[in-house]
Amino acid sequence: SAPSSSVPSSSTSPAAFLASGSAQPPPAERCPAACECSEAARTVKCVNRNLLEVPADLPPYVRNLFLTGNQMTVLPAGAFARQPPLADLEALNLSGNHLKEVCAGAFEHLPGLRRLDLSHNPLTNLSAFAFAGSNASVSAPSPLEELILNHIVPPEDQRQNGSFEGMVAFEGMVAAALRSGLALRGLTRLELASNHFLFLPRDLLAQLPSLRYLDLRNNSLVSLTYASFRNLTHLESLHLEDNALKVLHNSTLAEWHGLAHVKVFLDNNPWVCDCYMADMVAWLKETEVVPDKARLTCAFPEKMRNRGLLDLNSSDLDCDAVLPQSLQTS
């Protein structure tokens, strides 16, 4: 296992060094057998090693921990609790395992954890207290600043209650974990791409006041009617590309207009260019909020296909066309 380094030149702070009563620098830390460690880079990589659990003997200097491509199915409470604690761990990548369950308090005792990536795990059970660590109504703030949850949706046959109800349950599960105990009030980046979301639960974003970057790319969002962005006063980037959005209503447009710094990315959605689109088209022509607005084109009705939204006049937008059944709102 490669560069597990000796540390002839490492020393602790002067006070700690004197307190240790030692004239020698501390010995090099051991490296878990399935991992590659570099103390100089403060990085431990345990990648594609078929690990079933988090290694017990992680070196305390670790700041970057890559545990990707293994075979862990459950992350229990205190999975990273160590003595002494992994106080310097800042970035934890658990993507591409087989995690189905993340228990309450799985990331407790990581006081410096700023970035967590759980992408590409089929999470059927993400505890509401996975990030909060306790079931208090207002828990201690999590140190997390960036949370990467791309493609954490389980396969259809693993979702509860079949397809549609299972998706609703999945979205609710994720929303509960994001809002519990107000723990993620310091979160600045949230990635939720490729999760088959059909809608955004009303309270998904309610407890994330510091959010600056939100990625909802490549979902199946049909409407944003029930979502509220009003509290996201620091939001700078909102990615909604590659969804199933048909139209944006005035309530959503007004909320975005009220966010001082936001840029919204809307490319590659199946916009329905009928009479309900008039307000959105008028808004697009005026706004600076949508950098890719010149690329937005109609998908329906057939006679409007590939027309640029910015090229449309109110006289182009009528409601006499019949939409495909799959696009009709129930």
């Epitope: 490669a2 560069p3 602790t12």
Partner: antibody, heavy 122, light 107 residues
Framework: QVQLQESGPRLVKPSETLSLTCTVS????????WSWIRQPPGKGLEWIGE???????NYNPSLKSRVSISVETSKNHFSLNLSSVTAADTAVYYC????????????????WGQGTLVTVSS | EIVLTQSPATLSLSPGERATLSCRAS??????LAWYQQKPGQAPRLLIY???NRATGIPARFSGSGSGTDFTLTISSLEPEDFAVYYC?????????FGQGTKVEIK
């Protein structure tokens, strides 16, 4: 965007102590790691040492007996002291930070200060 | 300490040509290797990190490859502003060390 600026005497007498300060702007010194690197005229780069935001120092063994790096959080700067200097210590001294530009802890030197030439001469 | 040996010491090429710079480590550094560019009177600038990742704002003509002990920096088509000195640096073991540099000069 973090910016770094070195300051201190440009001329130091042999056997004295070279002292430089690096002021950090556009970011907090209480995150990332902070390094000193030097480059003798016409030569390559040599890492001197670093101090982490938690106060841990690491020094190049070739200089360890003479070097000390400290941080003053309240002033958002960190300092280098190199004792018992000789003409061989004449170099451009750079401060640099490692960490923080990407989400993952980043151990590469980016950005750097513009450097300050320190000449050791009587 | 890990010694990094860069070759060639000088590379004389014309704009538009392809530049291939080599860095060899005295022992494995895994992928903990970076490349920097330095122009006269300026501080070095990070180009490539973790052996093959381009730093923010670095043009696509710069690419890095390699792992273990042998690494390559490639500039696919030299622009006038690319003529400079290039250093590799490892961060696998203490202390971090730099290669002695390769100067890319106009032919």
């Amino acid at each position: 965007q973090v910016q770094l600026q070195e300051s201190g005497p440009r001329l130091v007498k042999p056997s004295e102590t070279l002292s430089l300060t690096c002021t950090v702007s556009g970011g907090s010194i209480s995150s990332n790691d902070w390094s000193w690197i030097r480059q003798p005229p016409g030569k390559g780069l040599e890492w001197i040492g670093e101090i982490s935001y938690s106060g841990i120092t690491n020094y190049n063994p070739s200089l360890k007996s003479r070097v000390s790096i400290s941080v003053e959080t309240s002033k958002n700067h960190f300092s280098l002291n190199l004792s018992s200097v000789t003409a061989a210590d004449t170099a451009v001294y750079y401060c640099a930070t490692a960490g923080g530009s990407s989400g993952w802890y980043d151990y590469w030197f980016d950005p750097w200060g513009q450097g300050t030439l320190v000449t050791v001469s009587s | 300490e890990i010694v990094l040996t860069q070759s060639p010491a000088t590379l004389s090429l014309s704009p538009g040509e392809r530049a291939t710079l080599s860095c060899r480590a005295s022992q494995s550094v895994s992928s903990y290797l970076a490349w920097y560019q330095q122009k006269p009177g300026q501080a070095p600038r990070l180009l490539i990190y973790d052996a093959s990742n381009r730093a923010t704002g670095i043009p696509a003509r710069f690419s890095g490859s390699g792992s273990g002990t042998d690494f390559t920096l490639t500039i696919s088509s030299l622009e006038p502003e690319d003529f400079a000195v290039y250093y590799c640096q490892q961060r696998s073991n203490w202390p971090p060390t730099f290669g002695q540099g390769t100067k890319v000069e106009i032919k």
